[in-house]
């Protein structure tokens, strides 16, 4: 978990301090002079003790990923498509997602993390099957796979964080145009 510190790496702080501070939750994110900082709630401390800490000092990728994903969901809900996560289409036919019957050898081919490859980057995402999936590009492979976001959050949180950081516009509170940017064709 992340440790509480001021401008020092985790290892340095642990050498200097007996007490270990554990991050309970990531509450917010900001950019100061080009550096990403997160607002942290510390386990066992009140909200008055919440602090902004530089991203590079933190060791809680799972909590950061959780925060970023919650922001993505909020960001989508806030968009002006009637305030809904999905556009106002008819309810989707979830039954259609049962995989078509494929050749035996094709269906036995390992997919996703089962391929044992190192994730390189996320090149897209979709919730069209009812579950958030990331399109994952792997190192030393041209073949990408759709993988469950919840699995990626655990297995490669840094890749997930990078994806969200590139894809979301933070703390530039939307102008009217930004607010409507996903509504026009």
């Amino acid at each position: 978990m992340g440790k509480k510190q001021n401008k020092k790496k985790v290892e340095e702080v642990l050498e200097e301090e007996e007490e270990e501070y554990v991050v309970e939750k990531v509450l917010d994110r900001r950019v100061v002079k080009g550096k990403v900082e997160y607002l942290l709630k510390w386990k066992g401390f009140s909200d008055e003790d919440n602090t902004w800490e530089p991203e590079e000092n933190l060791d809680c990728p799972d909590l950061i990923a959780e925060f970023l994903q919650s922001q993505k969901t909020a960001h989508e809900t806030d968009k002006s498509e009637g305030g809904k996560r999905k556009a106002d289409s008819d309810s989707e036919d979830k039954g259609e997602e049962s995989k078509p019957k494929k050749k035996k050898e094709e269906s036995e081919k390992p997919r996703g993390f089962a391929r044992g490859l190192e994730p390189e980057r996320i090149i897209g995402a979709t919730d069209s099957s009812g579950e958030l999936m990331f399109l994952m590009k792997w190192k030393n492979s041209d073949e990408a796979d759709l993988v469950p976001a919840k699995e990626a959050n655990v297995k490669c949180p840094q890749v997930v964080i990078s994806f969200y950081e590139e894809r979301l516009t933070w703390h530039s509170y939307p102008s009217e145009d930004d607010d409507k940017k996903d509504d026009k064709n």
Epitope: E76, I123, A125, T126, D127, L135, L168, D178
Partner: antibody, heavy 121, light 111 residues
Framework: AVQLVQSGAEVKKPGESLRISCKGS????????ISWVRQMPGKGLEWMGR????????NYSPSFQGHVTISADKSISTAYLQWSSLKTSDTAMYYC??????????????WGQGTLVTVSS | ASALTQPASVSGSPGQSITISCTGT?????????VSWYQQHPGKAPKLMIY???KRPSGVSNRFSGSKSGNTASLTISGLQAEDEADYYC???????????FGGGTKLTVL
């Protein structure tokens, strides 16, 4: 408002090089992929490839890989499609397009007005 | 991957419903619920009508709906109107090597 403004029509000779552009405005340019789509005269749409302007990572359709180069200059919010040696068969309307959502995989909701490229000897 | 298969033309009278099919393979339409549909009027840029199988962008009439069964996706337009006359293209994610593939297009005529 989201806008993709493409460069003007071009008339070229076979063997010449060309670069056409697509300038994005009204949104965070580096947060959205830019795709290029070809439409030959009287024909359908063909997906050529796309670029992530944040780091210039690209995906190409096998049909276009090696024939064109997609690039971007995020400092001026502009994506490019270029040819080093044009053929008469490159005559077409070329559209740049951007997805509705930052993370969309294979759909595009905002389109440029198109750039007509004519290659003729 | 070769283009998705669409009928060359479809027609209907005002007020009627029509369906345009888009047939792919288990490598594209069948594997992913990532089909989008575009409307293109002559001399204009395409317009997104449906994405991710059945989602409608804001501003698109609810007369347009999308669905999928097996390797075939469908666009249904109910209550046909004169302004619906246009070319319609489907497009699907087709795996990371091909990425996206369009259908050949369908000309819709409103009689």
């Amino acid at each position: 408002a989201v806008q993709l403004v493409q460069s003007g029509a071009e008339v070229k000779k076979p063997g010449e090089s060309l670069r056409i552009s697509c300038k994005g405005s009204g949104y965070s340019f580096t947060s959205y992929w830019i795709s290029w789509v070809r439409q030959m005269p009287g024909k359908g749409l063909e997906w050529m490839g796309r670029i992530d302007p944040s780091d210039s990572y690209t995906n190409y359709s096998p049909s276009f890989q090696g024939h064109v180069t997609i690039s971007a200059d995020k400092s001026i919010s502009t994506a490019y499609l270029q040819w080093s040696s044009l053929k008469t068969s490159d005559t077409a309307m070329y559209y740049c397009a951007r997805p509705l959502q930052t993370y969309s995989i294979a759909s595009v909701g905002h389109w440029g007005q198109g750039t007509l490229v004519t290659v003729s000897s | 991957a070769s283009a998705l298969t669409q009928p060359a033309s479809v027609s209907g009278s005002p007020g009627q419903s029509i369906t345009i099919s888009c047939t792919g393979t288990s490598s594209d339409v069948g594997s992913y619920n990532l089909v989008s549909w575009y409307q293109q009027h002559p001399g204009k840029a395409p317009k997104l009508m449906i994405y991710e199988g059945s989602k409608r962008p804001s501003g698109v009439s609810n007369r347009f709906s999308g669905s999928k069964s097996g390797n075939t996706a469908s666009l249904t337009i109910s209550g046909l109107q004169a302004e619906d006359e246009a070319d319609y293209y489907c497009c699907s994610y087709a795996g990371s090597s091909t990425f996206a593939v369009f259908g050949g297009g369908t000309k819709l005529t409103v009689l």
